[in-house]
């Protein structure tokens, strides 16, 4: 039979690969069927019988076409500072991302391993660079003529209001106070906010390599304590 119409298991022609969704079993020396995502190989193929696949058990998954003897365990439940953006199913691992107001301090292949609260800039300091999904807020001292009177991870330094007659000059943490009933020019009341980082998950559509490479493993590295940056408060 030509390779196109052979049924698994079959011996491939010398120099030929197996076809779509098949793998070469070294022991049987045959091309055999892979198991689909959500399944694993319960019984490996032989020269006369094809792979027997079985569904993954609860809390386990396989994301790729495979011939693994056991499904992979889903990651542990998301912690209180995280939200579950993808549930554990037979075909995909659980994905945890950081909740609003937090950023990912230690990422993993998909999602986040360790979240940390976004730095808050104390009065006299404003946000120089807003936080993102994977980076903390950077604070900077308010330049002359600007101020911030809040402890916030989103507020930037705002210009002092300009008075006809100044009662109390503004400083880095306080606006100017005017004696006249209305200032010449005033910023709109209320703090200026920077947008919170939005936790989005890019679709994982990486193509499937020939599964003959060893699986990668990640290790959680201990994180030593780090002093807060100037102008920030630990929360």
């Amino acid at each position: 039979l030509p390779a196109q119409v052979a049924f698994t298991p079959y011996a491939p022609e010398p120099g030929s690969t197996c076809r779509l969704r098949e793998y070469y079993d070294q022991t049987a020396q045959m091309c055999c069927s892979k198991c689909s995502p959500g399944q694993h190989a319960k019984v490996f193929c032989t020269k006369t019988s094809d792979t027997v696949c079985d569904s993954c058990e609860d809390s386990t998954y396989t994301q790729l076409w495979n011939w693994v003897p056991e499904c992979l365990s889903c990651g542990s439940r998301c912690s209180s500072d995280q939200v579950e953006t993808q549930a554990c199913t037979r075909e995909q691992n659980r994905i945890c991302t950081c909740r609003p107001g937090w950023y990912c301090a230690l990422s993993k292949q998909e999602g986040c391993r360790l979240c940390a609260p976004l730095r808050k800039c104390r009065p006299g300091f404003g946000v120089a660079r807003p936080g993102t999904e994977t980076s903390d807020v950077v604070c900077k001292p308010c330049a002359p003529g600007t101020f911030s009177n809040t402890t916030s991870s989103t507020d930037i330094c705002r210009p002092h209001q300009i008075c006809n007659v100044v009662a109390i000059p503004g400083n880095a943490s306080m606006d100017a106070v005017c004696t006249s009933t209305s200032p010449t020019r005033s910023m709109a009341p209320g703090a200026v906010h920077l947008p919170q980082p939005v936790s989005t998950r890019s679709q994982h559509t990486q193509p499937t390599p020939e599964p003959s490479t060893a699986p990668s493993t990640s290790f959680l590295l201990p994180m030593g304590p780090s002093p807060p940056a100037e102008g920030s408060t630990g929360d």
Epitope: S16, T17, R19, L20, R21, L64, P207, T208, E210, T213
Partner: antibody
Framework: QVQLVQSGAEVKKPGASVKVSCKAS????????INWVRQATGQGLEWIGW????????QYAQKFQGRVTMTRNTSISTAYMELSSLRSEDTAVYYC????????????WGQGTTVTVSS | DIQMTQSPSSLSASVGDRVTITCRAS??????LNWYQQKPGKAPKLLIY???KLHSGVPSRFSGSGSGTDFTLTISSLQPEDFATYYC?????????FGGGTKLEIK
């Protein structure tokens, strides 16, 4: 970034052979099939076959069996497609494309190599 | 070999329109249907694989549906950069085969 860069245009006489190269970069060359697909001017796409760079094994479309030879040089992450006994109907743009053998798609393509067969 | 038939072969539409292209397989191909976009003088680009999975970087206005033998590619709101030729391709059985293409032109 992941890319495939092909050799330049070729003009051949009927009966001759042509060898097109495809250099991969930005990923592990040996872990993905390299497919070859051709497209005659104003026509659709036609799959020729694939090579698995890890072991050099191939899978050819029946139509091209006996006329096509796919090889690779893993040290320079390059795949080759040689087509022999050329005829005018082989005039086309030849593309190499990285393939996925589970879903049968091509996710990264070379820029194409124009092969003209003319006497 | 599995024959893939696309319709229409050409289509005129305007920016903002919703467009549907269909692809029919000569036999059941399960969900192993992929879609590509090709612009003149360029290589095809993968848009959708396994019937409805969006390839990375592809805008969400592209979507795929269908099963068995009949499939559709939908562009929810045409953008100027979407005018191109679209090809379907089956990934179910060797040899891998493509549809004849649908040329999407500006009305």
């Amino acid at each position: 970034q992941v890319q495939l860069v092909q050799s330049g245009a070729e003009v051949k006489k009927p009966g001759a052979s042509v060898k097109v190269s495809c250099k991969a970069s930005g990923y592990t060359f040996i872990t993905y099939d390299i497919n070859w697909v051709r497209q005659a001017t104003g026509q659709g796409l036609e799959w020729i076959g694939w090579i698995y760079p890890r072991d050099g094994n191939t899978q050819y479309a029946q139509k091209f069996q006996g006329r096509v030879t796919m090889t690779r040089n893993t040290s320079i992450s390059t795949a080759y497609m040689e087509l022999s006994s050329l005829r005018s109907e082989d005039t086309a743009v030849y593309y190499c494309a990285r393939g996925d053998r589970d879903y049968g798609y091509f996710d990264v393509w070379g820029q194409g190599t124009t092969v003209t067969v003319s006497s | 070999d599995i024959q893939m038939t696309q319709s229409p072969s050409s289509l005129s539409a305007s920016v903002g329109d919703r467009v549907t292209i269909t692809c029919r397989a000569s036999q059941d191909i399960s969900n192993y249907l992929n879609w590509y976009q090709q612009k003149p003088g360029k290589a095809p680009k993968l848009l959708i694989y396994f019937k409805s999975k969006l390839h990375s970087g592809v805008p969400s206005r592209f979507s795929g549906s269908g099963s068995g033998t009949d499939f559709t590619l939908t562009i929810s709101s045409l953008q100027p950069e979407d005018f191109a030729t679209y090809y379907c391709q089956q990934g179910n059985t060797l040899p891998l085969t493509f549809g004849g293409g649908t040329k999407l032109e500006i009305k």
